[in-house]
């Protein structure tokens, strides 16, 4: 290899060792039967050489540094030249650097030919290996403005007092061009402007000068996005820290075309704008830092650009003035993550305050809109509190647990609407009345309607899931001991036009010790499947269900177990269950865990089941699952 | 484990010539370059020339030229460092080591092998 | 050839105390230094290389720096068994050299 540096040309050549891998041989740079280990080049120069091995790209790399003064002279300003061409150097990875300095008055501008530039984080690396990291300089101090790859949307920088780019190249790249060139600019007044331009839908993730470490003290960098007219840009902020400030504020500051409050000034921890039209501006201003204990200030966010969707220009009252104890909740149903870019898709808050969930709180009146390619990528879930602290008043009250048809009217799926009902220990306990019998979902009879009740214990200590229940069966009320939450979940759409099935009356009533009692009044044309809560789990220990099933006049019913055995072991106490006729007041008592459930009875009136678990032991829990058929009485059951 | 195991020493007549082994065992010898260092009683240290048992590929201190000649059998594991026409400049020890491509330094000594000079 | 200069043959330490030994290179050799540690009747042994990195197994209280032509390996609480003599080594440019060596003695 020759290299020859032309004199003058502020040109130094570097050679040598990379970052060490595990390769237990060496090479060396082999000058005139000397081994070296680095090579230096500069003006005027002109050097032979070879290297000891056959794959030297495995152990050294390449800089060509090239000094531009603007200090005593003109500036060469213009396309880039790569000198020497790359044609003439060995095969290394190469790094171009070239070092402009300029006075504090004068700006100096980076142009980036297509593609234009991405930044790139700590920790990530470009997927062709060409980087560029640019950094600038306040006075003696280096500032780092980034770290860049192809094909993205920064188009220019500008910076003052002079710039400092490396074009990094791994061997095998074939580039010989820089893909930028160097304008002269009037002062900018500030640390950087980093110019961002979209054609069409996409994102960018930026950084502030020395990410991840601290912003500069007391400066001022800017990103001017450049948008089309009917797309809209939306800003995120996706990791940032405050520093400790003596004197002003740290904070973020958006020119936005057509507002009439420019500048727009946000705190770092504010929700940041969205479906904002055409080109803006956003600046980071540092502060004054407390020289003891300075902190840092740092932000790393993402723009969206996508196009305006026909529900961002339509507004949606959502009016929990009424309301108490109620949260709604809009956010992103989980998907899996794809691959390609993923239009955002973001619920606004007075059209303006845009993220990608939002949660509303009653006491007030909300206006939103919907920044979103696809409204089924969201989800609605609320959460209402009922709760009773006085006993004398609360009794015998009632309320009904509807979802509001505000909520209804909005363009977004229900997925849940949790009521927490609470009620004072020991005093009083609750029952559930639907408009229309439920059925309880089971492996055997699965509901399929568009929504289901999800009933649980609410108390924080106690896992006890009553089951899910949907409209359409023979279960006529519910009633369980204390604090429960019922959970309206829906399943499909078409939810929409089944809510009028919806409706259930939660009421206050004298409190009783079992945990739960379902009273179910079978029809003639259906059989009847019912089973013990936290199914899969088990029955809590110590704990009681009972099932006031009735029977009408003319029918028979058929109690049918669907297992030999309950399965329970118990540690200490007893597992039992009692069968009682309701007229006779005659009794069979089971020992689930000892004896054989009970084959197929008939009871010719309304009886009671009555299961109480022991202290199970792990493994060995309680689980029954039985059915209730009626038949005619007419019909022979001999 | 690395080691270099190198031969006994020896006590040689001016004018002879002695030829000193260095046996690499917990490497393979091909895969790195074999340095060797003189050291005279009470002196320092001396670099004569490396290997690349590889190719055979020598590079020597000038001063050594003609003195020394190393060599290597990768089959055996085994470099050597053949001195000529000794005289009681020669007395020293005399260490093999090897040398990486991450350290570019002598990473493992052998233990030395004394060659005596002397009528 | 590059000349390696050690100026202190011997240094005179107690146990505890922190010493640094210099080594001065006739030209620059970019970081291209090592240091060595050599007890009585034993071989050389690698402490540093590249100039500040550390071989694997050397103690943490042994450090190298430096740049340019200006070496220095430092530790920072000598203890009874570093008494040796140590030698710094240019790796940048074939002739390898040595510098001749500093003699650490215990008071």
């Known amino acids: 290899f020759e290299i020859a540096l032309p004199r003058e040309s502020n040109i130094t050549v570097l050679i040598k060792l990379g970052t060490p891998t595990l390769l237990a041989k060496p090479c060396y740079i082999v000058i005139s039967k000397r081994h070296i280990t680095m090579l230096s080049i500069k003006s005027g120069e002109r050097i032979v050489f070879t290297f000891s091995c056959q794959s030297p790209e495995n152990h050294f790399v390449i800089e060509i540094q090239k000094n531009i003064d603007c200090m005593s002279g003109p500036c060469p300003f213009g396309e880039v030249q790569l000198q020497p061409s790359t044609s003439l150097l060995p095969t290394l990875n190469r790094t171009f650097i070239w070092d402009v300095k300029a006075h504090k008055s004068i700006g100096l501008e980076l142009q980036f030919s297509i593609p234009r530039l991405r930044q790139i984080g700590p920790g990530e690396s470009c997927p062709d290996g060409v980087t560029h990291s640019i950094s600038g300089r306040i006075d003696a101090t280096v500032v780092r403005i980034g770290t860049f790859c192809s094909n993205g949307t920064v188009s220019r920088i500008k910076m003052q007092e002079g710039v400092k780019m490396a074009l990094h190249l791994p061997w095998f790249h074939p580039r010989n061009v820089s893909g930028f060139s160097i304008a002269n600019r009037s002062s900018i007044k500030r640390l950087c402007i980093i110019e961002s331009v979209f054609e069409g839908e996409g994102s960018a993730t930026l950084m502030s000068a020395n990410y991840p470490e601290g912003f500069p003290e007391d400066e001022l960098m800017t990103w001017q996005f450049v948008v089309p007219a009917h797309l809209r840009a939306s800003v995120s902020f996706l990791n940032f820290n405050l520093s400790n400030c003596e004197r002003k504020e740290e904070r973020v500051e958006y020119y936005i075309p057509g507002s009439t409050t420019n500048p727009e000034v946000f705190k770092l921890e504010d929700k940041q704008p969205g479906n904002m039209a055409g080109n803006f501006n956003l600046s980071l201003q540092g502060c004054d830092q407390d020289a003891q204990s300075p902190g840092i200030l740092r932000l790393q966010f993402q723009v969206l650009v996508q196009h305006p969707q026909n529900e961002s220009n339509k507004i949606y009252v959502v009016d929990l003035s009424n309301e108490r104890a109620m949260s709604l909740t809009i956010e992103p149903r989980p998907v899996k993550q794809s691959r390609k870019f993923v239009p955002g898709c973001f619920v606004c808050l007075e059209s303006r305050t845009c993220s990608s969930n939002l949660t509303l709180t009653s006491g007030s009146k909300h206006k939103i809109s919907f920044l979103c390619d696809d409204l089924t990528r969201l989800w609605m879930n609320v959460e209402k509190t009922i709760s009773c602290t006085d006993h004398r008043y609360c009794q015998r009250k009632s309320y009904s647990l509807q979802v509001p048809s505000d909520i209804l009217h909005l363009p977004v799926e229900l997925h849940d609407f949790s009521w927490k009902l609470l009620v004072p220990k020991d005093r009083l306990s609750l029952v559930l009345v639907p408009a229309q019998k439920l059925q309880q979902h089971t492996h055997e009879k699965p509901c399929n309607t568009s929504f289901s009740y999800l009933v649980a214990s609410a108390i924080p200590s106690q896992d006890l899931y009553f089951g899910s229940f949907c409209p359409g069966g023979s279960i006529k009320q519910i009633q369980v001991k204390q604090n429960i939450s019922v959970t309206l979940r829906t399943f499909a759409p078409s939810f929409q036009q089944e809510a009028s099935r919806q409706g259930l009356t939660v009421s206050f009533i004298p409190y009783f010790k079992e945990e739960g009692v379902f009273t179910v009044t079978p029809d003639t044309k259906s059989k009847v499947y019912l089973r013990t809560p936290n199914w899969d789990r088990g029955l809590p220990s110590l704990t009681s269900v009972s099932w006031n099933i009735s029977v009408p006049r003319d029918q028979v019913a058929c109690l049918t177990f669907f297992k030999e055995r309950s399965g329970v072991v118990c540690q200490t106490g007893r597992a039992f269950m009692i069968i009682q006729e309701q007229r006779t007041r005659a009794e069979e008592i089971f020992s689930l865990d000892e004896d054989v459930l009970p084959k197929p009875s008939f009871h010719h009136h309304s009886f009671w089941v009555n299961i109480s678990n022991c202290s199970p032991t792990s493994g060995k829990q309680l689980d029954l699952l039985f059915s209730v058929t009626l038949t005619p009485r007419t019909v022979d059951l001999t | 484990e690395v080691q270099l195991q190198q031969s006994g020493a020896e006590l040689v007549r001016p004018g002879a010539l002695v030829k000193l082994s260095c046996k690499a065992s917990?490497?393979?010898?091909?895969?790195?370059?074999i340095h060797w260092v003189k050291q005279r009683p009470e002196q320092g240290l001396e670099w004569i020339g490396w290997i690349d048992p590889e190719n055979g590929h020598t590079i020597y201190d000038p001063k050594f030229q003609g003195k020394a000649s190393i060599t290597a059998d990768t089959s055996s594991n085994t470099a050597y460092l053949q001195l000529s026409s000794l005289t009681s400049e020669d007395t020293a020890v005399y260490y093999c080591?090897?040398?990486?491509?991450?350290?570019?330094?002598?990473?493992?000594w052998g233990q030395g092998t004394s060659v005596t000079v002397s009528s | 050839d590059i000349v390696m200069t050690q100026s202190h043959k011997f240094m005179s330490t107690s146990v505890g105390d922190r010493v640094s030994i210099t080594c001065k290179a006739s030209?620059?050799?970019?970081?291209?230094v090592a240091w060595y540690q050599q007890k009585s009747g034993q071989s050389p042994k690698l402490l540093i290389y590249w100039a500040s990195t550390r071989h694997t197994g050397v103690p943490d209280r042994f450090t190298g720096s430096g740049s340019g032509t200006d070496y220095t390996l430092t530790i920072s609480s000598v203890q009874a068994e570093d008494l040796a003599l140590y030698y710094c080594q240019q790796h940048y440019s074939t002739p390898y050299t040595f510098g001749g060596g500093t003699k650490l003695e215990i008071k």
């Open positions: 080591a090897r040398l990486t491509g991450t350290t570019y330094a002598m990473d493992y």
């Open positions: 030209q620059d050799v970019s970081t291209a």
């Open positions: 917990g490497f393979n010898i091909k895969d790195y370059y």
